[in-house]
Every structure is written in structure tokens, then in C-alpha cells.
């Protein structure tokens, strides 16, 4: 049972006023949070581009049982004095399981330090916990970043598990469907855990597939034939 009741869910609305939250940090002081550079969303290597360690755990209204994975937030702090007051963008990659406020970001050491004045990163981290302001923003990944579909380990012609990542705009995914080449019917994948979607089917899935993903704001995007014929498990495929 959370010590503090969560705030209302943060939805895909933008340009809103700043909201108050508490912030802490975990992991290595200049690291990306989890020891294994992962997190509850299922993303790996969050220390590397495009997340580049600007990552964090959100509590229930932010993580939303995995639905918040990939969403982006501007965060800033004004106190203590080491705070720059300038907003930085963080990506939700993990679940904050022990919230201390209705909205609580448990940030990577790197992201926490990024709110500091230049040279004061360690000073800010030594505060440990602080008040911050946040608002949902559209995700803008570095140019050349492609939406990536990771076919999870164990996937086979009767079972396909997909992790969708690096989605511009809303960032988070609320529905995933696939369509086999030459067929008209979309097959709906079911949400599993983290940001992984899956389908179990008695009919063999051979590929190539077009993947359609829907973000929280309702935008549907199709990645045509992104998963090729002869696709392999534990392999990532980039949209064209």
C-alpha cells in the first residue's frame, strides 16, 4: 500500500501548467539508474543514446502500470541554490515502487544532476531529495532515431512478443496491432508486462508484418513491413 496516495494520472496533454512533485535519485551518481541500465519497462541500455541516461522512475500516475513507459517530462527545480531553474527532459523507463509524494520522480543520478547549475551537479545530488516542477512534453528524439521494434526472446511463429521504443510525440504506446503482408486483417496484440505486447495464435505468423502502434493521444502510425520474413527472436527491427 503506497505511503502517499497517488495524484491523478498524467495524460497526453501538453503546454499545461507546471505541477509539483518530489524527486530523488538512485544508482550511480552519474549513471542511468538501474545497475543493469534497464528498468521495469523492459528497455535495455538506457545509458546509451537516445535515452542517454536522462531517465527515471515514475510513480503510479506517471508509470501507469507500464502504459507510461517512454513518455517524456520536462522537470526543473529552483531550490536548493544549486538548482538551475532550467527545464530538462527525462524519459520514463522504470517504475517507482516507493513513492513519497502524489507525484514522485526517482531519477537517474545523471538526470537529477542535469537540473543543477553547471558545475553544481554533485552538490545538487548531495541534497538527495528535492521539490521539482514537471509537465508532460512531446518526446523529441535526436535526428536519425528510428522507432524500434524488439522481437522478444522466445518468440516463435505462434507467439510474438514486441517491445516498441523510441516513439516521438506522446512517447508511450497504448495499442499495438500487426498485419501480415497480403492480408487485410489487423491482429491485436495484448498488453503483457512492462512495455511488452504479445499475441498467441494457432495460426503461424510468418511475416513480413506491418506494425501499427497507437499512442496515448490517439495517433496511429504504421511501420510497413518492419518485421521481415524470416524474423528472429531477440532481435530489433527499425522502422524505415
Amino acid at each position: 500500500i503506497p505511503k502517499v496516495p497517488p495524484g491523478p494520472n498524467i495524460t497526453a496533454t501538453y503546454g499545461d501548467k507546471w505541477l509539483d512533485a518530489k524527486s530523488t535519485w538512485y544508482g550511480k551518481p552519474t549513471g542511468a539508474g538501474p545497475k543493469d541500465n534497464g528498468g521495469a519497462c523492459g528497455y535495455k541500455d538506457v545509458d546509451k543514446p537516445p535515452f542517454s541516461g536522462m531517465t527515471g522512475c515514475g510513480n503510479t500516475p506517471i508509470f501507469k502500470s507500464g502504459r507510461g513507459c517512454g513518455s517524456c517530462f520536462e522537470i526543473k527545480c529552483t531550490k536548493p541554490e544549486a538548482c538551475s531553474g532550467e527545464p530538462v527532459v527525462v524519459h520514463i523507463t522504470d517504475d517507482n515502487e516507493e513513492p513519497i509524494a502524489p507525484y514522485h520522480f526517482d531519477l537517474s543520478g545523471h538526470a537529477f544532476g542535469a537540473m543543477a547549475k553547471k558545475g553544481d551537479e554533485q552538490k545538487l545530488r548531495s541534497a538527495g531529495e528535492l521539490e521539482l516542477q514537471f509537465r508532460r512534453v512531446k518526446c523529441k528524439y535526436p535526428e536519425g532515431t528510428k522507432v524500434t521494434f524488439h522481437v522478444e526472446k522466445g518468440s516463435n511463429p505462434n507467439y510474438l512478443a514486441l517491445l516498441v521504443k523510441y516513439v516521438n510525440g506522446d512517447g508511450d504506446v497504448v495499442a499495438v496491432d500487426i498485419k501480415e503482408k497480403g492480408k487485410d486483417k489487423w491482429i491485436e496484440l495484448k498488453e503483457s508486462w512492462g512495455a511488452i505486447w504479445r499475441i498467441d495464435t494457432p495460426d503461424k505468423l510468418t511475416g513480413p508484418f506491418t506494425v501499427r502502434y497507437t499512442t496515448e493521444g490517439g495517433t496511429k502510425t504504421e511501420a510497413e513491413d518492419v518485421i521481415p520474413e524470416g524474423w528472429k527472436a531477440d532481435t530489433s527491427y527499425e522502422s524505415k
Epitope: 534497464g38 521495469a40 523492459g42 528497455y43 535495455k44 522478444e152 522466445g154 518468440s155 503483457s192 512492462g194
Partner: antibody, heavy 116, light 107 residues
Framework: ESGGGWVQPGRSLRLSCSAS????????MHWVRQAPGKGLEWVSG????????AYADSVKGRFTISRDNGKNSLYLQMNSLRPEDTALYYC??????????????WGQGVLVTVSS | ELVMTQSPSSLSASEGDRVTITCRAS??????LNWYQQKPGRAPKLLIH???TLQDGVPSRFSGSGSGTEFTLTISGLQSEDFATYYC?????????FGGGTTVDVK
């Protein structure tokens, strides 16, 4: 499984589960508990590569699941233990690697008793 | 969280009887439903996964059916070794949840 025993409320325990006879990193793993005379309660699960970890609401923020594929081992770090955590704790192997599906192999269970 | 409701909670039967146990999900779980058998002092054993697929080595007198929210485990021709407690469990989403169990004992 190992690491069980009697502990006072508020204290910590770490459970371990060592697997043999299977390719450990091909499967998701779970902890399931059973209070004396009661039914089964899923506690936590972890995907093959630790990419996803999930918890029951009753243990969220207190328990941490982890695995070491090199040692074929699964762990459950239990902090801030409560009397209601008293149970037989089973480690269980999933049929799948990346998503939860069905638990086809179970350990013999390890007893955790929390009381003052 | 998804609530799994099992009925009955207990039943008495004789060898050779046909036994039916029902499991209801609070919302659709498609066919992500498993059945386990547990005997006193033993770990649970997987009988059926994906609502109707018999696990290797499980006798064919066990069968499962249903999809969506309503599921059934049937034992056709109860044997002495089948007196045990049976649990359903959904794996559609986390937290994974079990039904409360059905104990099958000797009439």
C-alpha cells in the same frame, strides 16, 4: 530455495533459489507464496534478462526481485517485513522468457515466519 | 487488479465421478488461464495452460475449456490420486492472480 527462517517485523531477509537442469536464462522466473492454510499468491516476477520486474501491490516498495544468470540463481530481497508476509515462498519457472505465461516447475518452498 | 473467482470452494466426490470446477475472471483474459493441482505438503503442479492445453505428462482425463471470462476444469473419471486442491491463475496481466482454490475430497 534457501534463506528463510524466523524474523521480527521490520527486519529483512533474502531468499535464494538455485536452478539446475535447465537453461536458466531462457525463462522468466517468479516468486509465489502461500500463507499457512491459505491459497497461492503471486509475489513477483522477472523476465529472462531482468528487463522487466513486476510485483504484487502487497509487496511493492518492500521486496526486490533479481537474478544472476551466470549463477543460475533467483533472489528475493524482503525488507520491512510484516506478520502478514508469513508464508511458504516458492520460486517457479515460467514456460516463457519475456512475458508471463504459466509456471511449469516449482521449488519445494522455503518458510518465512515474521513475528515478534 | 484482475480478480479470479473459483467455485465451488470445496466439493466431495467419489472415484469415477466427473468433476467440474469453474473459474471466472473480473474482466476478459482471452485464453490466458492456467490450472494447477496441489497436494498437501507439496508444491503446485501445472495441469493446463492457455485454458485448454494439457501440460506434458498430465493424464487425458483432465481437460480445460473457456475463454474471455468463464473457464472450466473437468476431471472425467476421478482417480484416487486426483483428490487435491485446484487453482486457476490468469497470466493476461500483472499482477498475476490466482483463484481461491477448490478442494476435492472423498465423499
Amino acid at each position: 530455495e534457501s534463506g528463510g527462517g524466523w524474523v521480527q517485523p521490520g527486519r529483512s531477509l533474502r531468499l535464494s533459489c538455485s536452478a539446475s537442469g535447465l537453461t536458466f536464462d531462457d525463462y522468466a522466473m517468479h516468486w509465489v507464496r502461500q500463507a499457512p492454510g491459505k491459497g497461492l499468491e503471486w509475489v513477483s516476477g522477472i523476465s529472462w534478462n531482468s528487463g522487466v520486474r513486476a510485483y504484487a501491490d502487497s509487496v511493492k516498495g518492500r521486496f526486490t526481485i533479481s537474478r544472476d544468470n551466470g549463477k543460475n540463481s533467483l533472489y528475493l530481497q524482503m525488507n520491512s517485513l510484516r506478520p502478514e508476509d508469513t508464508a511458504l515462498y516458492y520460486c517457479a519457472k515460467d514456460i516463457r522468457a519475456a512475458t508471463p505465461y504459466a509456471l511449469d516447475h516449482w521449488g519445494q518452498g522455503v518458510l518465512v515466519t515474521v513475528s515478534s | 487488479e484482475l480478480v479470479m473467482t473459483q467455485s465451488p470452494s470445496s466439493l466431495s466426490a467419489s472415484e469415477g465421478d466427473r468433476v467440474t470446477i469453474t473459474c471466472r475472471a473480473s474482466r476478459t483474459i482471452y485464453n490466458y488461464l492456467n490450472w494447477y493441482q496441489q497436494k498437501p505438503g507439496r508444491a503446485p503442479k501445472l495441469l493446463i495452460h492457455a485454458a485448454s492445453t494439457l501440460q506434458d505428462g498430465v493424464p487425458s482425463r483432465f481437460s480445460g475449456s473457456g475463454s474471455g471470462t468463464e473457464f472450466t476444469l473437468t476431471i472425467s473419471g476421478l482417480q484416487s490420486e486426483d483428490f487435491a486442491t485446484y487453482y486457476c491463475q490468469q497470466s493476461h496481466g500483472t499482477p498475476l492472480t490466482f483463484g481461491g482454490g477448490t478442494t476435492v475430497d472423498v465423499k
